[in-house]
């Protein structure tokens, strides 16, 4: 069942069917005998009870006050009263834009990230049984879609999808043709979830080592799921049997990003491992960032300023 009209302030466009549904509907059915009344007040006017005789455009059904259609002079405050239950709405009826297929003030804005799932479904559950056809327009040009009962767009968003999408439902009531328009302003933005990957720590690291011993070089980064982190060393990786790239460790951060760590293990350090660059690179769609490690013999430590050392 269609949910009740809980918003106290409502703006609608003239010339369209419209309804107000009070929020104690289930209760009203239980107390069939209870007197239920709808009232309107506008400006200085006192509460005027509404009934089908007030206007040929107004219809009352159980919990609903219907307008066929709503017009500018319907602007005002509406009240539903039943026993000690009262619900109030303030209705503002605005002019239809005669030069467009939609009225700018009645547009719902949505932001969709490029390449993310994008969906527009033309549905109207309240008037569903009365709707005989529905059309979907983009920037007031009709889109040719298969389903003319509930036209739908389902796709991965492209920048070209940006625009105003209007669902127009055509329906008959008492021999008259009406239409209801619902417009979405779709803005396509770049993927906001991606971060620029960051390699943690200094860009250049001198590591003091002893010949014959082992060392573990730790490269850590904050990155996106699809970003890669890898070590580059020597002419061709893997040429030195004493150098091993350990399995990458990844931990998801509370923000949905990843903290990655990749260790390069150098065993039985020899002269050939000294004073050469061991580069750790993080690559993303935005580019690459690199940090470098240089192994330095402990005896040579005095030649290098203390702040460039890592352990």
């Amino acid at each position: 069942a269609e949910s009740c009209t809980s918003r106290p302030h409502i703006t609608v466009v003239e010339g369209e069917p419209f309804y107000l549904k009070h929020c104690s509907c289930s209760l009203a059915h239980e107390i069939e005998t209870t007197t239920k009344s709808w009232y309107k007040s506008s400006g200085s006017q006192e509460h005027v009870e509404l009934n089908p005789r007030s206007s040929s455009r107004i219809a009352l059904h159980d919990c609903v006050l219907e307008f066929w259609p709503v017009e500018l002079n319907d602007t005002g405050s509406y009240f539903f009263q039943m026993k000690n239950y009262t619900q109030k709405w303030k209705l503002n009826v605005i002019r239809r834009n005669k030069h467009s297929c939609f009225t700018e003030r009645q547009v719902t804005s949505k932001i969709v990230e490029v390449k993310k799932f994008f969906q527009i479904t033309c549905e109207n559950s309240y008037y569903q049984t009365l709707v005989n056809s529905t059309s979907l327009y983009k920037n007031c040009k009709k889109l040719l879609l298969e389903n003319n009962k509930n036209p739908t767009i389902k796709k991965n968003a492209e920048f070209e999808d940006q625009g105003y999408y209007s669902c127009v439902h055509f329906l008959h009531h008492n021999g008259k043709l009406f239409n209801i328009t619902k417009t979405f302003n779709i803005t396509i933005v770049e993927d906001r979830s991606n971060i620029v990957p960051v390699l943690l720590g200094p860009k250049l690291n001198h590591v003091a080592v002893e010949l014959g011993k082992n060392v573990r070089l730790n490269c850590s980064a904050l990155l996106n799921e699809e970003d890669v982190i890898y070590w580059m060393f020597g002419e061709e990786n893997g040429s030195d049997p004493n150098i091993h790239e350990e399995k990458e460790m990844r931990i998801m951060t509370p923000e949905g990003k990843w903290h990655a760590s990749k260790v390069l293990r150098i065993e039985n350090i020899g002269e050939s491992n000294l004073n050469v660059l061991y580069n750790c690179t993080v690559a993303s769609t935005g580019g690459t960032d690199t940090k470098s490690f240089i192994l330095v013999r402990k005896a040579d430590m005095a030649d290098i300023p203390g702040h460039v050392f890592t352990r």
Epitope: E190, V228, Y230, T285, G287, T288
Partner: antibody, heavy 115, light 113 residues
């Protein structure tokens, strides 16, 4: 509109240099790296290198190392590729492309190297 | 460098028939840490820049007809056109973006039989 607009065709003598520009619009320039890809007449695609717009880091193909320089100007959202010491086999269409899978390409710039 | 090898070099297929292009990488382009495959497919028509069709080995780029599909993992990949249309005549390239240099296959020329 999301696009990469490249500079016009160039004719150069062997030994000269060429600088091709690629102006980006419709997206955040610093969010994507820019690659340069070339295609000699009737040949396949050759990746020349790329530049990380957000930090200026570059990676060049080994065979072009020392002859190629890639730069960007973030104030104008423009990427540049300079190739020096041109040879006749550098005659090709030079493309700029966005990201690491190239979802956006420039139209290409024909560089002809001829004496 | 990762070497990408496509087969066949050229292919002739009848309209409405299935076309299959293979691509082999000299080392894996599957990243175990996130289980993603760093492989893309492009279509290039004469006088035009290449156009991205598939990325992550099997994700179709927005706007690309669903007759195009990509499959494979590790080192062996396939681009399939389920029902060849006249406008599909082009050269197709695979490319790895797992490690720099980001290398392309030599290309496969697709024609109508």
């Amino acid at each position: 509109q999301v696009q990469l607009v490249q500079s016009g065709a160039e004719v150069k003598k062997p030994g000269a240099s060429v600088k091709v520009s690629c102006k980006a619009s419709g997206y955040t320039f610093t969010s994507y790296g820019i690659s340069w890809v070339r295609q000699a007449p009737g040949q396949g695609l050759e990746w020349m290198g790329w530049i990380s717009v957000y930090n200026g880091n570059t990676n060049y193909a080994q065979k072009l190392q020392g002859r190629v320089t890639m730069t960007t100007d973030t104030s104008t959202s423009t990427a540049y590729m300079e190739l020096r010491s041109l040879r006749s086999d550098d005659t090709a269409v030079y493309y700029c492309a966005r990201g690491w899978y190239f979802d956006l390409w420039g139209r290409g710039t024909l560089v002809t190297v001829s004496s | 460098d990762i070497v990408m090898t496509q087969s066949p070099d050229s292919l002739a297929v009848s309209l409405g028939e299935r076309a299959t292009i293979n691509c082999k990488s000299s080392q894996t382009v599957l990243y175990s840490s996130n289980n993603k495959t760093y492989l893309a497919w492009y279509q290039q028509k004469p006088g035009q820049p290449p156009k991205l069709l598939i990325y992550w080995a099997s994700t179709r780029e927005s706007g690309v007809p669903d007759r195009f599909s990509g499959s494979g993992s590790g080192t062996d990949f396939t681009l399939t056109i389920s029902s060849l249309q006249a406008e599909d005549v082009a050269v197709y390239y695979c490319q790895q973006y797992y490690r720099t240099p980001y290398t392309f296959g030599q290309g496969t020329k697709l024609e109508i039989k």
